[in-house]
């Protein structure tokens, strides 16, 4: 028996669910009762999910996973992940067995996308040029953990006196807060871009200091 | 006709480890999960965990998780379950049983942890 | 975990008399329930499974029912040999759990 699953990670975002995708190629006269299809953590052989001696014995995972039963007989032993969290990340070892066995794996990579940045200054009054001031760059919800850009108004990447943090909650996904102090000129834009490195998703935020007021 | 056959007793000192052993034989040993249960005297069942000998996939009561390792031999057809940091609660009947239906059982291995 | 209550702990019958042992399930465990006999000194031995199902070899005096979460294994016509404790079981979800079982009395 040859067991086939795809070889581009899956790519899965939070609380979606996912199909993790593998497949055999049943001989003809092949019953149920003949499969042992087992899912397994790759790393750790933690029992995922399995249909051994004639049934579907159950998910031994969160009770968040399921096979397809009515395409079980046609060689599809695809496992469904419902409400994919961050810990679901990982690899999967798809393992078949009839009167030979094979084995795959597939990758899961979770992700979620980043809020739209909120920008904070600091002070946020009585400013002049040549002061120095702090922008401040949050970014909630995301994973897996971003990237930072930040540019002025004429596009021009800023990368001294940056400082960026990301800290993941207790769902796993990170908050970003990144700083940029800066001495500020008679007028300009600081831009503040967020990526998602997974999804190749960018979240854009701006402040425009031209003397006061501020627009943000 | 399938057998399960297990050692009769173990004596061991606490917070010492021992290995446990379940040998099958009468059917194809790859193709049956096989699970140990304890049992301490005059009390119920409680199921520790199973194992795939054909991938060697496990899963496991979270109660036993960090007390219990499941291990198989293919080439002896035979399952191990080591158990770690031995106390008195430890003293039980361990069984081994085949198949997600438990339908055959071994003779069960009486452990005593004492100094 | 789902807890399975066998809220009997002894029964008493005599030989040739019909007697229930009865097992509820915390939740619906569906029919994936099992029932074993467990002799003096002996291990526990299958009876039935999938709630009805009666092993090949056990005698079809031993009978099951339930599906959700009652279920009872009647013996009929008890014999002498039937002096054990039984324990239901269910693998409808993990972890697997047992009954606290039940000790048939011969009078």
């Known amino acids: 028996v040859e067991v086939q699953v795809s070889e581009d990670p899956v790519v899965a975002l939070v609380d979606t669910d996912a199909t993790l995708r593998c497949s055999f190629s049943p001989e003809p006269g092949f019953s149920l009762a003949q499969l042992n299809l087992i899912w397994q953590l790759t790393d750790t052989k933690q029992l995922v999910h399995s249909f051994t001696e004639g049934r579907d014995q159950g998910s031994a995972y969160s009770n968040r996973t399921a096979l397809f039963p009515d395409l079980l007989v046609q060689g599809n032993a695809s496992l469904r992940l419902q409400r994919v969290r961050v810990t679901d990340e990982g690899s999967y070892t798809c393992f078949v067995s009839i009167q030979d066995f094979d084995s795959a794996a597939v990758s899961l990579q979770v992700a979620a996308p980043y809020s739209k940045p909120s920008m904070t200054l600091e002070p946020n009054k009585d400013l002049r040029p040549g002061n120095m001031v702090t922008i401040t760059c949050s970014s909630y919800q995301g994973y897996p953990e971003a990237e930072v850009f930040w540019k002025d108004g004429q596009g021009v990447p800023l990368t001294g006196n940056v400082t960026t943090s990301q800290m993941a909650n207790e769902r796993g996904l990170f908050d970003v807060h990144s700083v940029l102090r800066v001495v500020l000129g008679a007028n300009g834009t600081y831009s503040c871009l967020v990526r998602n490195p997974v999804l190749q998703q960018d979240a854009h935020g701006s402040v425009t200091i031209t003397g006061q007021p501020l627009t943000f | 006709q399938v057998q399960l056959q297990q050692p009769g007793a173990e004596l061991v000192k606490p917070g010492a480890s021992v290995k446990l052993s379940c040998k099958a034989s009468?059917?194809?040993?790859?193709?049956?999960?096989m699970h140990w249960v304890k049992q301490r005297p005059g009390q119920g069942l409680e199921w520790i965990g199973m194992i795939h000998p054909n991938s060697g996939s496990t899963n496991y009561n979270e109660k036993f998780k960090s007390k219990a390792t499941l291990t198989v031999d293919k080439s002896s057809s035979t399952a191990y379950m080591q158990l770690s940091s031995l106390t008195s609660e430890d003293s039980a009947v361990y069984y081994c049983a085949r198949g997600g239906y438990f339908d055959y059982w071994g003779q069960g291995t009486t452990l005593t942890v004492s100094s | 975990d789902i807890v399975m209550t066998q809220s009997q702990k002894f029964m008493s019958t005599s030989v040739g008399d019909r007697v229930s042992v009865t097992c509820k399930a915390s939740q619906n465990v569906g029919t994936n329930v099992a029932w074993y006999q467990q002799k003096p000194g002996q291990s526990p031995k299958a009876l039935i499974y999938s709630a009805s199902y009666r092993y090949s070899g056990v005698p079809d005096r031993f009978t099951g029912s339930g599906s959700g979460t009652d279920f009872t294994l009647t013996i009929s016509n008890v014999q002498s040999e039937d002096l054990a404790e039984y324990f239901c079981q269910q693998y409808n979800s993990y972890p697997y759990t047992f009954g606290g079982g039940t000790k048939l009395e011969i009078k």
């Open positions: 009468g059917y194809t040993f790859t193709s049956y999960w």
